[in-house]
């Protein structure tokens, strides 16, 4: 008969593959969250672990489309994170929606070179107008 291949010896310390749950956001239905990992193995020391994960989202989805916020101007660029942030305060909650009272959104600063003075003044004007509007 056919010679059977010798079975691979399974070490006592061997563990099964990690099986991961879906990413569960810490807050809202996207953004930073955690996922649970499990694996089998009789002699496996670590059979469970939690891992940080992220579900991408735009801020509108993250804070609920029924939640309307008034935002401040963008803050200065944080050189450590290369992000700038701004805070919004709740103005209106449509249909009894459950909304966070204040929210913070971040975006990359882009290149940290000084913009041309003309572009800068135009941008400031635009930001001022935008601020007056209540943003969705």
């Amino acid at each position: 008969g056919k010679k059977e291949k010798p079975e691979k010896k399974v070490k006592k310390s061997d563990c099964g593959e990690w099986q991961w749950s879906v990413c569960v956001p810490t807050s809202g239905d996207c953004g930073l969250g955690t996922r649970e990992g499990t694996r089998t193995g009789a002699e496996c020391k670590q059979t469970m672990k939690t891992q940080r994960c992220k579900i991408p989202c735009n801020w509108k989805k993250q804070f609920g489309a029924e939640c309307k916020y008034q935002f401040q101007a963008w803050g200065e660029c944080d050189l450590n994170t290369a992000l700038k942030t701004r805070t919004g305060s709740l103005k209106r909650a449509l249909h009894n929606a459950e909304c966070q009272k204040t929210v913070t959104i971040s975006k990359p600063c882009g290149k940290l070179t000084k913009p041309k003075p003309q572009a800068e003044s135009k941008k400031k004007k635009k930001e001022g107008k935008k601020q007056e509007k209540m943003l969705d």
């Epitope: 807050s27 809202g28 239905d29 939640c67 249909h95 009894n96 929606a97 459950e98 966070q100 009272k101």
Partner: antibody
């Protein structure tokens, strides 16, 4: 993951008050509203109100104003509901409940319920 | 307050049958600006907390695809395409169009 753990059953006398609790874990407690829902035996569900633990802001169903008082303790991530001047009509299971995300008020997370029995 | 009316109050079905539960609201739950219906369905098994099944006709994660939410405006339906023994429960609809949030009185699903 989000967990809502409610306090145990209560047997109280008519006219007295009772304070039941709902301890939350697994999420940013301060920035999510917590709701309370009443269910009388064999009856439907009634929304009592909700509280925002971040600043203690609350919103009540008019029917329960003066009957229920909602408070929150950020240090223990616990929301409380006090029911006053109890009558047999207040005998019910009370649930705390939370939405999954910001936005529409449908409840994805529920506590296991606290049975309040009002009896002389 | 918006009044939610469910029918029937109870019904007995055999495993494999199709079940249709009805929920009517005293005013429209449809926002014409975003075309969203502000209605949810819950299942409550004896001695348990309610469980979210469907919101705005979207099935909650982990809910079997035999549960289908439909309808718009004031008339809504929860259909169980092939009822299973584990579906024995009370079913409630809830409006979240305006405060106070209100629930239907429920439909008790029993098995023949």
């Amino acid at each position: 993951q989000v967990q809502l753990q409610q306090s145990g059953p209560e047997l109280v006398k008519p006219g007295a008050s009772v304070k039941i609790s709902c301890q939350a874990s697994g999420y940013a407690f301060s920035s999510h509203w917590m709701n309370w829902v009443k269910q009388r035996p064999g009856k439907g569900l009634e929304w009592i109100g909700r509280i925002y633990p971040g600043d203690g802001d609350s919103l009540y169903n008019g029917k329960f104003k003066g009957k229920a008082t909602l408070t929150a303790d950020k240090s223990s991530t616990t929301v409380y509901m006090q029911l006053s001047s109890l009558t047999s009509e207040d005998s019910a299971v009370y649930f705390c409940a939370r939405t999954r995300a910001y936005g529409p008020a449908w409840f994805a997370y529920w506590g296991q319920g606290t049975l309040v029995t009002v009896s002389a | 307050d918006i009044v939610m009316t469910q029918s029937p109050s109870s019904l007995a079905m055999s495993v494999g049958q199709k079940v249709t539960l009805s929920c009517r609201s005293s005013q429209s739950l449809l926002d014409s600006n975003n075309q969203k219906n502000y209605l949810a369905w819950y299942q409550q098994k004896p001695g348990q907390s309610p469980k979210l099944l469907v919101y705005a006709s979207i099935r909650e994660s982990g809910v079997p695809d035999r549960f289908i939410g439909s309808g718009s405006g004031t008339d809504f339906t929860l259909t169980i395409t092939s009822v299973q023994a584990e579906d024995l429960a009370d079913y409630f609809c809830q409006q979240h169009y305006s405060t106070p949030l209100t629930f239907g009185a429920g439909t008790k699903l029993e098995l023949k």
